[in-house]
């Protein structure tokens, strides 16, 4: 019962998690730009790993998305293919773990194919989390280094002078929701590992028994394979093979023609 | 790197009408607002007009009713159009743009300055 539970536990979280992935990689709100007051209209302006917005006092709102790869910061497409790897992981991995459950039945699946597909989505999930907090991770931190931030507050190009406005770029939405979207995802691949463990059929260690004959007296002790007959050095019944069972081996048996040991 | 073109500018008598451009290019991926500031001899520079990405429009107190601001977002560009033109008004003109230039880098952007002289 608590296998299914923490097994239907983990899946929930997972599913949560990813579902949160999905929507950080989504959104625009990875970067935010604080407002700047001009004095036409005060400029929001904030940034996704898709594309660019800029919002205005008045509610007017401008998207636009990066249609070139080529002027694109490498660190973006690291970030960029991070949550895709993510993404898709996660997905695969809930897609394993559906057919992995308890609760459910498909065919005369064995315990020991669903605890193998438990702990495949497991590991999915924990690589998808990760690849998730790493990507946000790599956002953030070049946020705080200035990645992409103009370096020259002023200079003079061809048409003018021109100015840097505004280098202060700080953490938007997004990547909070793929942090803790991440996290979750990672606990929800680590509660499938543990549920594994306990889908998973030991091999169950036979303790030796005998089973007296009721006319001859016979020992069986499954265990040892070597036979010895009831006379020389063997009349008293010591073992001559112990299996690692402790039941009944010192069970005093007449020596018969055949003692079975 | 983002340029400007101002063009229009000249020498027009009181009473007159003289309609200024400015033309923007390069890493754009905004422009949220564009407009005209002016600067006489001696004097600071101020605002005589600016429109936003939206439309929202701001004139100094100098020149409303007479000067009118619009611009084409196609061709990221911005116009003025000055009527009534009084000696006042002489100064030299610079194009402003606030744009939002590769990713992470808002830039206002000065024009070199076009002239416009009101003489009779």
């Known amino acids: 019962m608590a296998v299914t539970a923490c097994q239907g536990l983990g899946f929930v979280v997972s599913l949560i998690g990813i579902a949160g992935i999905i929507a950080a990689t989504c959104m625009d709100q990875w970067s935010t730009q604080d407002l700047y007051n001009n004095p036409v209209t005060a400029v929001f302006n904030y940034q996704g790993l898709w594309r660019s917005c800029v919002r205005e006092s008045s509610g007017f709102t401008e998207c636009r998305g990066y249609f070139t790869l080529l002027g694109l910061p490498a660190m973006l497409q690291a970030v960029r293919a991070l949550m895709i790897v993510g993404i898709v992981l996660g997905a695969i991995g809930l897609l394993v773990s559906i057919f992995a459950l308890k609760c459910i039945r498909i065919g005369s699946m064995e315990d020991s194919a669903k605890a193998n597909m438990t702990l495949t989505s497991g590991i999915m999930f924990i690589v998808s989390g990760l690849c998730a907090i790493a990507g946000v991770s790599v956002f953030a931190n070049m946020l705080v280094t200035n990645f992409w931030m103009s370096t020259a507050n002023m200079y003079t190009g061809m048409g003018g002078m021109v100015q840097t406005v505004q280098t202060r770029y700080t953490f938007g939405a997004a990547l909070f929701v793929g942090w803790v979207a991440g996290g979750l995802t990672l606990i929800g691949g680590v509660m499938m590992c543990i549920a594994c463990r306990g889908l998973a059929p030991e091999e169950t260690n036979y303790k030796a028994v005998s089973y007296h004959a009721s006319g001859h007296s016979v020992a069986y002790k499954p265990g040892g394979f070597k036979a010895s007959t009831g006379f020389g050095s063997n009349t008293k019944n010591k073992k001559i093979y112990d299996g690692g069972a402790r039941t009944e081996d010192e069970v005093q048996s007449y020596p018969s023609k055949h003692d079975y040991v | 790197q983002v340029q400007l073109v101002e063009s229009g500018g000249g020498l027009v008598q009181p009473g007159g009408s003289l309609r200024l451009s400015c033309a923007a290019s390069?890493?754009?991926?905004?422009?949220?607002?564009m407009g005209w500031y002016r600067q006489a001899p001696g004097k600071q520079r101020e605002l005589v007009a600016g429109?936003?990405?939206?439309?929202?429009?701001n004139y100094g107190d100098s020149v409303k009713g007479r000067f009118t601001i619009s611009r084409d977002n196609a061709k990221n560009t911005v116009y003025l159009q000055m009527n009534s033109l009084k000696p006042e008004d002489t100064a030299v003109y610079y194009c402003?743009?606030?744009?939002?230039?590769?990713?992470?880098?808002?830039?206002?952007?000065w024009g070199q300055g076009t002239l416009v002289t009101v003489s009779s």
């Open positions: 390069g890493s754009i991926f905004h422009i949220p607002v």
């Open positions: 429109i936003s990405r939206g439309g929202t429009t």
């Open positions: 402003n743009v606030l744009v939002v230039s590769g990713i992470g880098s808002t830039l206002e952007v």
